[in-house]
């Protein structure tokens, strides 16, 4: 799995361990092994929500299989909640879009998932 | 709707008020509630298009519905005039990726929009 | 098509003319005109795979067709080898999602490819 | 070192409500999902859920939707199941146990036997 | 919901011979590249050990004489040799999707 996040919010707001934890509770949200998660935080960015500049975010999680109505709604409770508590950003100014990637969509190690 | 703009097009090139305008044209030309809009806009990227490094852009506009062939025409004509206009990159060094969003594969305010 | 690395390698690590073997290497592996090929590299980005931050990539191939089974490990076994070579990336430490886009839900010159 | 220590045995009867606790200690309690696992006297394990021990969100297998709950306490590092209108086919022996990342149990409680009769 | 079919339901074997468990999944228990098995043993009266995790990994502390292997859908569970302490009942578990289903356990008796 291969969670972004894109945000306003500065680099200096990103909290020292943030993705590491993300790492640990997507490895529990999505039962993979946390050796095959990808995070990736991108601050300080030129974006608006709602046509404010207040602090935003516009993420995807990408993973094969594990996607699906209860499990985005379980996910977008988890990653909302992380976002709010780590970097302040209301729930509300968050958008999360979810992919069910097929293995043979997924490239690594020079191959495929297929 | 999310429309995220990547281009290589410097920062102090991007005009004061280009990410409210783009939120109020595509309020208008999705017919969706501004409220709803986020716009993303990523310059001074290391990017080509065609081998060289003119002002280019890759794009993408996410929207759960309201998107389809005559739609996509419709939006690509707005967009490509936006970026032309605003940031002078040619409409032939624009790619812009159309996704149709489920629902459920949408986050938002801790759940999501199924 | 349009190729996408976002990888926490430093800019000063990407070597000259790293864009220009892209759109070489993928014109020849689409068999597409290289005037049509898009790249697009980040470095310097805040990532981790698997926890950690040695170098990695989160990379994306979007095209219309030719996209596929035997395509993408292909394109995987190219794209990992660039990487490795010319960043100093573990293929185990890369991602590529790969995506056959609709031609409609392409935008280009002020339309679509539909 | 790691421990997961639940309660004790329970005898109830038909319609009676029962909480089972399982007490972790040892590790970051909300980094872990928990899982439940019964077994009915001589029987097989079957899975019950699992709760999300960062978001309080569980998930019921189908044969555990309705009078099944699970619930945490984190300030005390504690997991709950709550079984209400207690039937006798509910006897069985429960189990608490950790997931490690990739959704194997690593770490078992020692089981909490639930008897019910009338 | 994946079944998963142990094989043999029990085993009677003398010490020092090797004992093999199947465990077959009705669909593939594959996602990236690991197979989401893991094997457990269960003594009466107490509760079930991790024992193989992800198809082929030893959980710290299990003898090497506890080996995992398959892919997909079949999957295998070696115990060589066997001794008197691992009379016990094994499961197999797939983590794949959920619900997290079980095997429905084989009993191994040391002669």
């Known amino acids: 799995p291969m969670f972004i996040v894109n945000t306003n919010v500065p680099r200096a707001s990103v909290p020292e361990g943030f993705l590491s934890e993300l790492t640990q509770q997507l490895a529990q949200a999505t039962g993979k092994p946390a050796q095959y998660i990808a995070v990736h935080v991108v601050p300080d960015q030129l974006m608006t929500f709602s046509g404010t500049n207040d602090p935003c975010a516009l993420c995807s999680l990408h993973s094969i299989g594990k996607i699906g109505g209860a499990q985005n709604r379980n996910y977008s409770k988890l990653l909302c909640g992380l976002l709010s508590d780590r970097l302040h950003i209301s729930p509300d100014r968050v958008y999360i879009n979810y992919y069910d990637m097929n293995a043979a969509n997924v490239g690594w190690n020079g191959s495929t998932f297929a | 709707p999310m429309f995220i703009v990547n281009t290589n097009v410097p920062r102090a090139s991007v005009p004061e008020g280009f990410l409210s305008e783009l939120t109020q044209q595509l309020a208008q030309a999705t017919g969706k509630p501004a409220q709803y809009i986020a716009v993303h806009v990523v310059p001074d990227q290391l990017m080509t298009f065609s081998g060289t490094n003119d002002p280019c852009a890759l794009c993408s506009l996410h929207s759960i519905g309201k998107i389809g062939g005559a739609q996509n025409r419709n939006y690509s004509k707005l967009l490509c005039g936006l970026l032309s206009d605003r940031l002078h990159i040619s409409p032939d060094r624009v790619y812009i990726n159309y996704y149709d969003m489920n629902a459920a594969n949408v986050g938002w305010n801790g759940s999501t929009f199924a | 098509p349009m190729f996408i690395v976002n990888t926490n390698v430093p800019r000063a690590s990407v070597p000259e003319g790293f864009l220009s073997e892209l759109t070489q290497q993928l014109a020849q592996a689409t068999g597409k005109p290289a005037q049509y090929i898009a790249v697009h590299v980040v470095p310097d980005q805040l990532m981790t795979f698997s926890g950690t931050n040695d170098p990695c990539a989160l990379c994306s191939l979007h095209s219309i067709g030719k996209i596929g089974g035997a395509q993408n490990r292909n394109y995987s076994k190219l794209l990992c080898g660039l990487l490795s070579d010319r960043l100093h990336i573990s293929p185990d430490r890369v991602y590529i999602n790969y995506y056959d886009m609709n031609a409609a839900n392409v935008g280009w010159n002020g339309s679509t490819f539909a | 070192q790691i421990q997961l220590v639940q309660s004790g045995p329970e005898l109830k009867k038909p319609g009676e409500t029962v909480k089972i606790s399982c007490k972790a200690s040892?590790?970051?309690?909300?980094?872990?999902?928990m899982n439940w696992v019964s077994q009915p006297p001589g029987k097989g394990l079957e899975w019950m859920g699992w709760?999300?021990?960062?978001?309080?969100?569980?998930t019921y297998a189908d044969d555990f939707k309705g009078r099944f709950a699970f619930s945490l306490d984190t300030s005390a590092s504690t997991a709950y199941l709550t079984i209400n209108n207690l039937k006798n086919e509910d006897t069985a022996t429960y189990f608490c146990?950790?997931?490690?990342?990739?959704?194997?149990?690593?770490?078992w409680g020692q089981g909490t036997t639930l008897t019910v009769s009338a | 919901n994946i079944v998963l079919t142990q094989s043999p339901a029990s085993l009677a074997l003398s010490l020092g011979q090797r004992a093999t468990i199947s465990c077959r999944t009705s669909?593939?228990?594959?996602?990236?590249?690991?197979?989401?098995m893991h094997w457990y043993q269960q003594k009466p009266g107490q509760s079930p050990k991790l024992l193989i995790y992800?198809?082929?990994n030893l959980e710290s502390g299990v003898p090497a004489r506890f080996s995992g292997s398959g892919s997909r859908t079949d999957f295998t569970l070696t115990i060589d040799p066997v001794e008197a302490d691992d009379a016990a009942t094994y499961y197999c578990?797939?983590?794949?999707?959920?619900?997290?289903?079980f095997g429905g356990g084989t009993q191994l008796e040391i002669k």
């Open positions: 578990q797939q983590s794949n999707e959920d619900p997290r289903t």
């Open positions: 709760i999300n021990t960062y978001t309080g969100e569980p």
């Open positions: 146990a950790r997931s490690n990342y990739g959704n194997y149990f690593d770490y």
């Open positions: 992800l198809a082929s």
């Open positions: 040892g590790y970051s309690f909300r980094n872990y999902g």
């Open positions: 669909e593939s228990v594959d996602s990236y590249a690991s197979s989401f």
